[in-house]
């Protein structure tokens, strides 16, 4: 039994890191393998993660971690019984994939303005709380070409757009994702999408 693709890990910079790897053949990850991990810290203890299958030869492990700080470094040991298959380390702050924003809501009761709001996925004491920026994706269910991205580079988790920038009388969907420039993170997954019917009064045309 050998590791074909070494574990690569990403952290949500809060409490979970996810590590994925591939073996050289079909493997029952949960029965044959264990991933041991430990924060390099005087007051830390070793933890064991039981991996799950992720395709025939792929494995994935969700590591429960202490609140992350930038200096953290974890040792990782992948075991098959008594055999050490791979040894490595992981700095969560260097491999961050933020949590997805939640509670995306479209408020349509503001005069001819759409207000989209969502929740920051981090608590106020987390470093990323004040460092997230967002991308909002809006698309038409009727017209695949009607697809747009709004970059929200301010901290407030909201976006205002004129309803008239979208077509009236049809349904739209929106979703939002996050990233943090300070740690050069990847983008989060998209939030669940939300749907609304866009309607607004056309301005009266004079001839």
């Amino acid at each position: 039994m050998k590791v074909l693709q070494e574990p690569t890990c990403v952290s949500d910079y809060m409490s979970i890191s996810t590590c994925e790897w591939k073996m050289n053949g079909p493997t029952n990850c949960s029965t044959e393998l264990r991933l041991l991990y430990q924060l390099v810290f005087l007051l830390s203890e070793a933890h064991t993660c039981i991996p799950e299958n992720n395709g025939g030869a792929g494995c994935v492990c969700h590591l429960l971690m202490d609140d992350v700080v930038s200096a953290d470094n974890y040792t990782l040991d992948l075991w098959a019984g008594q055999q050490l298959l791979w040894k490595g380390s992981f700095k969560p702050s260097e491999h961050v994939k933020p949590r997805a924003p939640g509670n995306l809501t479209v408020h349509t009761n503001v005069s001819d303005t759409l207000l989209l709001t969502w929740s920051n996925p981090y608590p106020p004491d987390n470093y990323l709380y004040n460092h997230l920026t967002y991308a909002v994706n809006i698309w038409s269910e009727n017209d695949p070409a009607d697809f747009r991205i709004y970059n929200v580079t301010y901290l407030e988790p909201s976006l205002r757009i004129a309803a008239s920038t979208l077509k009236s009388g049809i349904s739209y969907r929106a979703r939002v994702r996050a990233w943090a420039q300070c740690y050069n993170t990847t983008w989060s997954e998209w939030s669940p999408s939300t749907k609304w019917h866009n309607s607004y009064r056309e301005p009266f045309e004079q001839h």
Epitope: S15, V40, L43, D66, A71
Partner: antibody, heavy 115, light 109 residues
Framework: EVQLVQSGGGLVHPGGSLRLSCAGS????????MFWVRQAPGKGLEWVSG???????NYADSVKGRFTISRDNAKNSLYLQMNSLRAEDMAVYYC?????????WGQGTLVTVSS | EIVLTQSPGTLSLSPGERATLSCRAS???????LAWYQQKPGQAPRLLIF???SRAPGIPDRFSGSGSGTDFTLTISRLEPEDFAVYYC??????????FGQGTKVEIK
């Protein structure tokens, strides 16, 4: 807002015992290492003890064998049991959250050791 | 055990002046594990700088940290009246734990 609220200081005779408490709020207590740091009157800061998320502990040589740090994650609370107290243990004791450094501190509680 | 020595013991300056505080370690310290604190009379210490040069949340940009190895510096670019206090450096070591310097008092001249 992260808060650490301390209680339990007071006057004790040499050789006596005292238990300090620290209640945390505004953060996930169970995912953070916690510490006690003290400051003798007019002196600098001295690290006393720390406890990891899994219960691993460490002590300064000056208190080893006499002080015991513990935590109750269900109550978001940190404790310091101080036995065989000496005159040199007299100080303001602070609880703190942290790891390699201490990012949030309690208000401090005075422990006076005097006969 | 790593010993941190701060200098000067006392720094007498006027508001608006630049303050430079030194922290010297008896052996090399990882920059990731060097921090600075401010303490005012009757108050708990407050984290200013961690990782030798990163400002803690809410700390004004007139505070900056620098250095590596055994020599570290805290600089206050223009002293405000509320900056007069005692400043401590602190390090963490995987074997010895946590130690503080003896402090530098920044007082009004």
């Amino acid at each position: 807002e992260v808060q650490l609220v301390q209680s339990g200081g007071g006057l004790v005779h040499p050789g006596g015992s005292l238990r300090l408490s620290c209640a945390g709020s505004g953060f996930t207590f169970s995912r953070n290492a916690m510490f006690w740091v003290r400051q003798a009157p007019g002196k600098g800061l001295e690290w006393v003890s720390g406890i990891g998320t899994g219960g691993a502990t460490n002590y300064a040589d000056s208190v080893k064998g006499r002080f015991t740090i513990s935590r109750d994650n269900a109550k978001n609370s940190l404790y310091l049991q101080m036995n065989s107290l000496r005159a040199e243990d007299m100080a303001v004791y602070y609880c703190a959250r942290g790891r390699y450094y201490f990012d949030y501190w309690g208000q401090g509680t005075l422990v006076t050791v005097s006969s | 055990e790593i010993v941190l020595t701060q200098s000067p013991g006392t720094l007498s300056l006027s508001p608006g002046e630049r303050a430079t505080l030194s922290c010297r370690a008896s052996q090399s310290v990882s920059s990731s594990y060097l921090a600075w604190y401010q303490q005012k009379p009757g108050q708990a210490p407050r984290l200013l700088i961690f990782g030798a040069s990163s400002r803690a949340p809410g700390i004004p940009d007139r505070f900056s940290g620098s250095g590596s190895g055994t020599d570290f510096t805290l600089t206050i670019s223009r002293l405000e009246p509320e900056d007069f206090a005692v400043y401590y450096c602190q390090q963490y070591d995987h074997s010895a734990g946590w130690t503080f310097g003896q402090g530098t008092k920044v007082e009004i001249k």
